[in-house]
Amino acid sequence: HTAAQDNCTCPTNKMTVCSPDGPGGRCQCRALGSGMAVDCSTLTSKCLLLKARMSAPKNARTLVRPSEHALVDNDGLYDPDCDPEGRFKARQCNQTSVCWCVNSVGVRRTDKGDLSLRCDELVRTHHILIDLRHRPTAGAFNHSDLDAELRRLFRERYRLHPKFVAAVHYEQPTIQIELRQNTSQKAAGDVDIGDAAYYFERDIKGESLFQGRGGLDLRVRGEPLQVERTLIYYLDEIPPKFSMKRLTA
């Protein structure tokens, strides 16, 4: 697909190998791990990025209270199965034939089972709540400046349409970014909120996925915004199905 022709690299994904053997001898970039060609003009899907990562040599009322159905990614890294479009397959299994169902961002949404476990459809994560705590600063950031800067970041760095950034909440030192994107709202070519959130998460951790760019330098009116803790909550269009044992644990 498209890539920087002069030196044949993928600006939006450093977890690729690019070579001049694409159509017409053009630069073509393939994700590590899956070997799938990626479109370097946009973000790569989280599933392909995880696969590449596993294969690579390596005021109170303004804050949102995550719903009881919100998922947090407690399982950490795994080597996912991706579908032909690079999205997560609804059912994931490990080497020991333990299987579970995931949502569109690859987070487990059922108890673990065996190979007989059925996951009928990939359930879409339509609401993502990114909960950040910033390091102490001389004073609180101006809310509207912070809001504008984070919206600009998601629009320009992650190419996420502004309409999908539903809200930015702030109560020092906590910042919450709400991303919302229903199946019906997502048009062809739109960046997925799950992919944008994953790129943002890796940026915040100082593990940028962008090729050759410096790390994320977030500033609000010239003041550095340094994040010391990140929590991401995922809300699915259909609530997850966990046993009572887990819910009461």
Epitope: H1, V17, S19, P20, P23, S34, M36, A37
Partner: antibody
Framework: QVQLVQSGAEVKKPGASVKVSCKAS????????IGWVKQAPGQGLEWIGD????????NYNEKFKGRATLTADTSASTAYMELSSLRSEDTAVYYC?????????WGQGTLVTVSS | DIVMTQSPDSLAVSLGERATINCRAS??????????MHWYQQKPGQPPKLLIK???NLESGVPDRFSGSGSGTDFTLTISSLQAEDVAVYYC?????????FGQGTKLEIK
């Protein structure tokens, strides 16, 4: 002009290993994937895996994972395919090719015979 | 793994006539821009030779009687006017995802 020259035929005993080489010339070796393909006598083509010499990245067909090892020596512009724990069904011609799918240049092939 | 199925397994065509070989993938191997499908010719005792890359791009030096078409899961290699030197086995291969599997081959002969 682009050329891929492979090492000569080998006869091996079951359980042994074989290492086939593929010497590239006429292009920048580190810029292209090198793929390896097996062709058993009278049979079709089977993709083994590929290697990107520029970074040493490898991909393997699950069927050959654990037995096939792909390496490259960039100073010698040479790619290698080592196959271990040989058995009779490994008797085949092994080809190297430049490129991922759609290999545009191929080596002449190396016949590996596994026989006790 | 993506399974590539060629049809027919063998084909006999008169000199000067059109030869058509089909290849079906078990899932789509196309995006809106490209199809990751390639065609090879192999003659006895020789390595495969790339004819068509990305479904329809003719490799340089390949006669223009060879053409490729198709997208999604169904692809076709066509030889518009068969010549004696076209007798060979033809293979399709995808490069959508690992492993990059081949079709089983189609043997083309002169009728």
């Amino acid at each position: 002009q682009v050329q891929l020259v492979q090492s000569g035929a080998e006869v091996k005993k079951p359980g042994a290993s074989v290492k086939v080489s593929c010497k590239a010339s006429g292009y920048t070796f580190t810029n292209y994937w090198i793929g390896w393909v097996k062709q058993a006598p009278g049979q079709g083509l089977e993709w083994i895996g590929d290697i990107y010499p520029g970074g040493g990245y490898t991909n393997y067909n699950e069927k050959f994972k654990g037995r096939a090892t792909l390496t490259a020596d960039t100073s010698a512009s040479t790619a290698y395919m080592e196959l271990s724990s040989l058995r009779s069904e490994d008797t085949a011609v092994y080809y190297c090719a430049r490129g991922t799918g759609g290999g545009d240049y191929w080596g002449q092939g190396t016949l590996v015979t596994v026989s006790s | 793994d993506i399974v590539m199925t060629q049809s027919p397994d063998s084909l006999a065509v008169s000199l000067g006539e059109r030869a058509t070989i089909n290849c079906r993938a078990s899932q789509s191997v196309s995006t809106s821009s490209y199809s990751y499908m390639h065609w090879y010719q192999q003659k006895p005792g020789q390595p495969p030779k790339l004819l068509i890359k990305y479904a329809s791009n003719l490799e340089s030096g390949v006669p223009d009687r060879f053409s490729g078409s198709g997208s999604g899961t169904d692809f076709t290699l066509t030889i518009s006017s068969l010549q004696a030197e076209d007798v060979a086995v033809y293979y399709c291969q995808h490069s959508w995802e690992i492993p990059y599997t081949f079709g089983q081959g189609t043997k083309l002969e002169i009728k």
